[in-house]
Amino acid sequence: GQNITARIGEPLVLSCKGAPKKPPQQLEWKLNTGRTEAWKVLSPQGGPWDSVARILPNGSLLLPATGIVDEGTFRCRATNRRGKEVKSNYRVRVYQIPGKPEIVDPASELTASVPNKVGTCVSEGSYPAGTLSWHLDGKLLIPDGKETLVKEETRRHPETGLFTLRSELTVIPTQGGTHPTFSCSFSLGLPRRRPLNTAPIQLRVREPGPPEGIQLLVEPEGGIVAPGGTVTLTCAISAQPPPQVHWIKDGAPLPLAPSPVLLLPEVGHEDEGTYSCVATHPSHGPQESPPVSIRVTETGDEGPAEGSVGESGLGTLA
């Protein structure tokens, strides 16, 4: 048999080998496709099947607009002018090339040593489903489940039967200072069909380094509070992913669960002291904030104690 590949919506003509080009002809076309349950013999006189498969005067079979349900086997049996029986057998597959794939929600930059979502590659309207592949600097990226992670999703349209593919790429770049170029390609896996490529995206990789700033905010401002009052300490860090935050009082760690906020309700003199927060990042060591002083006083009219937070209520690391 012969394998035939036809584009969805396009006409297809299958020739009946051995059939005389003009009537009288002795021939029989039969098909077994998604429209049939078994073999369907087509009437030479034509009929309701003509809209999907029609016998032409020269004995060939015309499929005016191939669809997914027309995939299957087509057979012709003809008797030639010399009375010899000739058989033709075709295996028909259909395809649809999707629109150009796109990288949606691309990253603006990447951070070395931590997982980064590069973007999601989307291809819409393919048949069969096909595959999406990622490329780094023009070379095929093979997901290893560690430094290179790909999350794939395939959906089929309930009416058209066409596929939408999504592929989300996450990478852990090893070093900063580089400018890798990522692209994605769609392939139907058919012979003589070149892959469709997205426009490439070039991203800067920066070293994680310390966060740009770790600030300790105190409420009330100045860190002076009357007995029974409440003090709120907030450790503000501009780092992704958010690090774990521990608290230190007078140089000793406080036995509390990690949290960027420390609440001291109904303070007494035992809560007085110097507080700081320590942020621990996965990619580098712990980082401590500047300290703030908490004073509990009856009058509340004293100025800031030495070493306490100034007017802004912020302790900023230079």
Partner: antibody, heavy 119, light 107 residues
Framework: EVQLVESGGGLVQPGGSLRLSCAAS????????MTWVRQAPGKGLEWVAS????????YYPDSVKDRFTISRDNAKNSLYLQMNSLRAEDTAVYYC????????????WGQGTLVTVSS | DIQMTQSPSSLSASVGDRVTITCRAS??????VNWFQQKPGKAPRRLIY???NLADGVPSRFSGSRSGTDFTLTISSLQPEDFATYYC?????????FGGGTKVEIK
Amino acid sequence: EVQLVESGGGLVQPGGSLRLSCAASGFTFNNYWMTWVRQAPGKGLEWVASIDNSGDNTYYPDSVKDRFTISRDNAKNSLYLQMNSLRAEDTAVYYCARGGDIRVSLDHWGQGTLVTVSS
Amino acid sequence: DIQMTQSPSSLSASVGDRVTITCRASQDVGIYVNWFQQKPGKAPRRLIYRATNLADGVPSRFSGSRSGTDFTLTISSLQPEDFATYYCLEFDEHPLTFGGGTKVEIK
């Protein structure tokens, strides 16, 4: 909304001719085969003719072949049935319907037009 | 030509009854059978297409089934508006052939 409206029915003498029309709206006319079906008074339904979407291919039962001609004008979204050599047994309500092939078969019908063949 | 033998030609039933109408094709027609409902003075209305599929806007009490060349229309619980004549149609081959019809009357 799909609408099919037949016209052209009436009283005609045996041996006479009549042309029925069907005006289609609410769908892309040239995407569909079209069909005429008739129903004699108090009787069942009988297929009369079908035409493919381009109008290139027409189909008839033996009872009307060579007497009736189905045609279409896709620019006007119209279907026609030219009936010649009419006989008393052609008396019926004639319906136009959308489809007639294996993809879509008679999913929408017109209200019908009565043809009476009598002397 | 294909014959579509429809039975019964008429039946009497009450509201709430389960009603079954059958069409037998004289040769294999695959799934290419429709069912229609017709009320006096009105055009036929398609109920079931390709043997088992419910047409748009048709109540779910109507269903179609197939076993080889036997096709069945079932009304699970007959309603007052269901008293009408029902036809099957084969559209696998020309000439397109309708069954003779089944008139469903009030008992």
